[in-house]
Interface confidence: medium
């Protein structure tokens, strides 16, 4: 017997009635006495409404439940479901037997729309560009769980300090709660879109805030023109400073190091004390200078990863800001040489030289050249590859006829460091060996 | 009327760098970001960055990071995109864009006419 | 980053036919905008917000999602609109759009 039933699931909101379709069809003479309906939770087996013996049986599911009796007999065997919750979501059983027997099941889908953003703001007073503030957009009685988006006004997304939080009440309805932690700037827009990914449903919040800036001007903040240069591996100092006023004290003051692009929080110093290091705990200020004016940071252990520009924010009753650039650099190795093939070489035979060095930062700039110090810019290939901590492994190849004789150079330069290593393979006119036999 | 009046088209040397500007008209120049889109000949769009004209903001797709500058005049309300170490795979149509609309939906809603930057030895 | 991946990437068709484009981004997005593109011309809004039609766009253009894939449908294909369709999202960096759908008369 063929049961029909929806592909697509049946999606219900919350508190409104849902039609569960299933039909059959009846042969001619059919009569209802001979058919047995049963509705069932596919999961758990549970009846949930049957048609036996000629007769509704009624409902076994919450007296929620009933059937189009008369339709019944044109094999409409669907089921209303009254006054939809969240716990009904999933799948039904439709089961037909009259001789023959068939069953399908559908799924029924429960959604609820999302309330629009309420949008609060922690502080919410005094505020100055400098600050750091807590942005909360809360939505509420939805299902199911939302997908939370933060937005500038600009349009760009805020991907950065977010905690989205959604916890069920007893109907399993989410209440949504997601925290933007920002440090502000002269103004800006931020905004919440809520999104009920059954519904496609977007509801959405903005909050817009104007720091005060005090009329007095702003802080003057002063750090390197030039990219502070580190070696991984090391300790790098982000050089930061300010002039303090007269009776200045460091209750007064809100230090804020964050990078420039993410707007990610690397240290703070507020309401009088250090609030330590939001970056991987390697982070320090000089603690003893601050109430002379140096804002610096310590940055230890420095990474490939750790490269970019670093915003120092100063907020006294004025507010001032800069960004210093981090370029992290590793020296390259002592190029080791291979030649190949290595043994019984005549002029005139081709051979590959491999100049291989490693683990350096920036990308190396490779040069070849004879023993006169001619460019030999030929026949080379050269290839680098970042190892998991971004460092890089230089091979680059040059692919040479050999002469009566000839030394081959290869250097390996740090461009940022200005650093230079090389090595060299001599190839004489007799037939030889590489590496030369003791 | 809105406009993005973009420069005329280049012809550059590979290694050479590249400087093409963006004037805006009929709104106000610092109130929208202003997007470089660039199209290579038969090819689709890919993102190269934008400029916020107001605070001077930028960002980048980071594959034009190392090699691409962002700058806006705000007293000519023109906006400028710098590309340098011009390669032969920079042949393409730029365009500039103002990304517009309304928290949160933000979309290009008027764009330059385009220019033409042929990079040939 | 999000990749955007239409589908087909050359489409061709005739006057009055219905037509989908298909735009999958690799993970959820806030909202999706489109572009046509004529050539020799510069990219035109035409879809934005998911679902929005830009001003002066005929109501014969619709969009609908289902989960992560977007999809734009044309009711009745008139000349005007054999062109290249861009989608395009800014849900986090970078920006990227999809790599075009060329409608063609058949």
């Known amino acids: 017997l063929e049961v029909q039933v929806p592909e697509d699931p049946v999606v219900a909101l919350v508190g409104t009635d849902a039609t569960l379709r299933c039909s059959f069809s009846p042969e001619p003479g059919f009569s209802l006495a001979q058919l047995n309906l049963i509705w069932q939770l596919t999961d758990t087996k549970q009846l949930v409404h049957s048609f036996t013996e000629g007769r509704d049986q009624g409902s076994a599911y919450a007296n929620r439940t009933a059937l189009f009796l008369d339709l019944l007999a044109q094999g409409n065997a669907s089921l209303r479901l009254q006054r939809v919750r969240v716990a009904d979501e999933g799948s039904f059983t439709c089961f037909v037997s009259i001789r023959d027997f068939g069953s399908a099941a559908v799924s029924l889908q429960v959604a609820a729309p999302y309330s629009k953003p309420s949008m609060t703001l922690e502080p919410n007073k005094d505020l100055r560009p400098g600050d750091t503030v807590t942005i909360t957009c809360s939505s509420y009685r939805g299902y199911p769980e939302a997908e939370v988006f933060w937005q500038d006004g600009q349009g760009a997304p805020l991907t950065g300090n977010v905690t989205t939080s959604q916890m069920a009440n007893e109907q399993g309805l989410f209440d949504v709660h997601s925290v933007l932690r920002v440090v502000l700037g002269a103004n800006g827009t931020y905004s919440c879109l809520v999104r009920n990914p059954v519904l496609q449903q977007d509801a959405h919040g903005s909050i817009t805030i104007t720091p005060q800036r005090s009329p007095t001007g702003a802080v003057e903040v002063q750090v390197p023109e030039d990219p502070v240069v580190a070696l991984v591996g090391t300790d790098a100092t982000l050089r930061c400073s300010f002039s303090p006023e007269p009776g200045f004290s460091l209750a007064q003051l809100n230090l804020i190091w964050q990078l420039t692009d993410t707007k990610q929080l690397v240290h703070s110093f507020t309401e009088g004390r250090d609030q330590g290091s939001a970056y991987a705990n390697r982070t320090a200020l000089f603690l003893d200078l601050l109430a002379q004016g140096n804002a610096s940071l310590r940055l230890q252990r420095v990474r490939v990863a750790d490269e970019g520009s670093f915003t120092c924010f100063v907020s006294i009753r004025d507010f001032g800001s800069a960004a210093v650039s981090l370029q992290v650099a590793a020296p390259y190795s002592k190029p080791s040489m291979t030649l190949e093939p290595n043994k019984d070489l005549r002029p005139g035979d081709t051979v590959t030289i491999t100049c291989s060095s490693y683990r350096g930062y920036p990308e190396a700039e490779v040069f070849w050249q004879d023993g006169q110090g001619a460019p030999l810019t030929g026949n080379v290939t050269t290839s680098q590859m970042a190892n998991e901590q971004g460092l890089f492994d230089v091979h680059s190849v040059l692919r040479v006829v050999l002469g009566a004789n000839g030394t081959y150079s290869c250097l390996v330069r740090n461009p940022v460091l200005q650093q230079d290593a090389h090595g060299s393979v001599t190839i004489t006119g007799q037939p030889m060996t590489f590496p030369p036999e003791a | 009327e809105v406009q993005l009046v973009q420069s005329g088209a280049e012809v550059k040397k590979p290694g050479s760098s590249v400087k093409v500007s963006c004037k805006a008209s009929g709104y106000s120049f610092t109130s929208y970001t202003i997007h470089w889109v660039r199209q290579a000949p038969g090819q689709g769009l890919e993102w190269i960055g934008y400029?916020?004209?107001?605070?001077?903001?930028?960002d980048y797709n980071q594959k034009f990071k190392d090699r691409t500058t962002l700058t806006a005049d705000r007293s000519t309300s023109t906006a400028y995109m710098e590309l340098s170490s011009l390669r032969s795979e920079d042949t393409a149509v730029y365009y500039c864009a103002r990304y517009s609309g309304s928290t949160p939906y933000w979309y290009f809603d008027v764009w330059g006419q385009g220019t033409t930057v042929t990079v040939s030895s | 980053d999000i990749q955007l991946t239409q589908s087909p990437s050359f489409l061709s068709a005739s006057v009055g036919d219905r037509v989908t484009i298909t735009c999958r981004a690799s993970s959820s997005v806030s909202y999706m905008n489109w572009y046509q593109q004529k050539p020799g011309k510069s990219p035109k809004p035409w879809i934005y917000a998911t679902s929005n039609l830009a001003s002066g766009v005929p109501s014969r253009f619709s969009v609908s999602v289902s989960g992560t894939e977007h999809t734009l449908t044309i009711s009745s294909l008139q000349p005007e609109d054999f062109a290249t369709y861009y989608c395009q999202q800014w849900s986090s960096n970078p920006l990227t759009f999809g790599q075009g759908t060329k409608l063609e008369i058949k």
């Open positions: 400029i916020n004209p107001n605070s001077r903001n930028t």
